[in-house]
Amino acid sequence: GTIETTGNISAKKGGSVILQCHLSSTMAQVTQVNWEQHDHSLLAIRNAELGWHIYPAFKDRVAPGPGLGLTLQSLTMNDTGEYFCTYHTYPDGTYRGRIFLEVLESSVAEHSARFQIP
């Protein structure tokens, strides 16, 4: 299996950004997707049957989706850093993808460079 992510992305301070991962090249069943921040704190969990769980610190500015992705709103400079999606699958096990988000002071158009993690 392969995780494809939105790669390195930029977004404006005060704006919002969509963090997206996609698992391909496997027939494994996705049981859960975990979203974690650069300091290894948890943002959200998406359980395949029950749906979303949002970590308390992010309840006011994280919107689940689209899909298995996550929308982070009201961005601050402190949001700059790595984000990880962890796919828990059966029977394959765990797949992990990385996204780097840069929050910019000035108005810069979002840039998305897609890359793959085998």
Epitope: L42, I45, E49, W52, H53, R61, A63, P64, G65
Partner: antibody, heavy 127, light 106 residues
Framework: EVQLQESGPGLVKPSQSLSLTCSVT????????WGWIRKFPGNKMEWMGF???????SYNPSLKSRISITRDTSKNQFFLQLHSVTTDDTATYSC?????????????????????WGPGTMVTVSS | DIQMTQSPSLLSASVGDRVTLNCKAS??????LAWYQQKLGEAPKFLIY???SLQTGIPSRFSGSGSGTDFTLTISGLQPEDVATYFC????????FGGGTKVELK
Amino acid sequence: EVQLQESGPGLVKPSQSLSLTCSVTGSSIASDYWGWIRKFPGNKMEWMGFITYSGSTSYNPSLKSRISITRDTSKNQFFLQLHSVTTDDTATYSCARMPSFITLASLSTWEGYFDFWGPGTMVTVSS
Amino acid sequence: DIQMTQSPSLLSASVGDRVTLNCKASQSIHKNLAWYQQKLGEAPKFLIYYANSLQTGIPSRFSGSGSGTDFTLTISGLQPEDVATYFCQQYYSGWTFGGGTKVELK
């Protein structure tokens, strides 16, 4: 105050089905997430499954082939059925609520913990 | 499955003592941990969520700490009404419970 109360037969024969009812007052089962948990002799506890505010279900993989959780919103009750029971299913069965949180996108999300429980009902599987 | 191990299984203490109960996860669960109190013949009572957040209405002598794999429930100043079994539960991946710690008075 949310209250839950389990009811059902205390004795079930091996190979038969165990059927329990959880009656809820103080909260609508059409909101939040509602679960069944059992405690075996010796204190080991096991999450069995949930029924959600929308009526969809999630089951412990170890029980998936034998378990069914349903509900009756008009009576504010939800139900557990466990098929083909053995003596290993002897336990105290409890129902509980897992609260929800409404997100920015008006989506109901689960909180993970159980904030209200029933007192539990002891079920013995024996011939 | 994530295994949750509680220690000790039995704890004897005196009224007023500071009591510490431990819960260990078999892998990191971040702070996705809850604590419950169950008295004999009663429904479990929800005490703490996210490892250290006290549920509304729970006395402040109860506190939780920890993250990752090691967690602690502390009762600072044990009261007679605190005699009960305490158990932890993770909700990082599925839902699993510890075996419980029974707290009794010396």
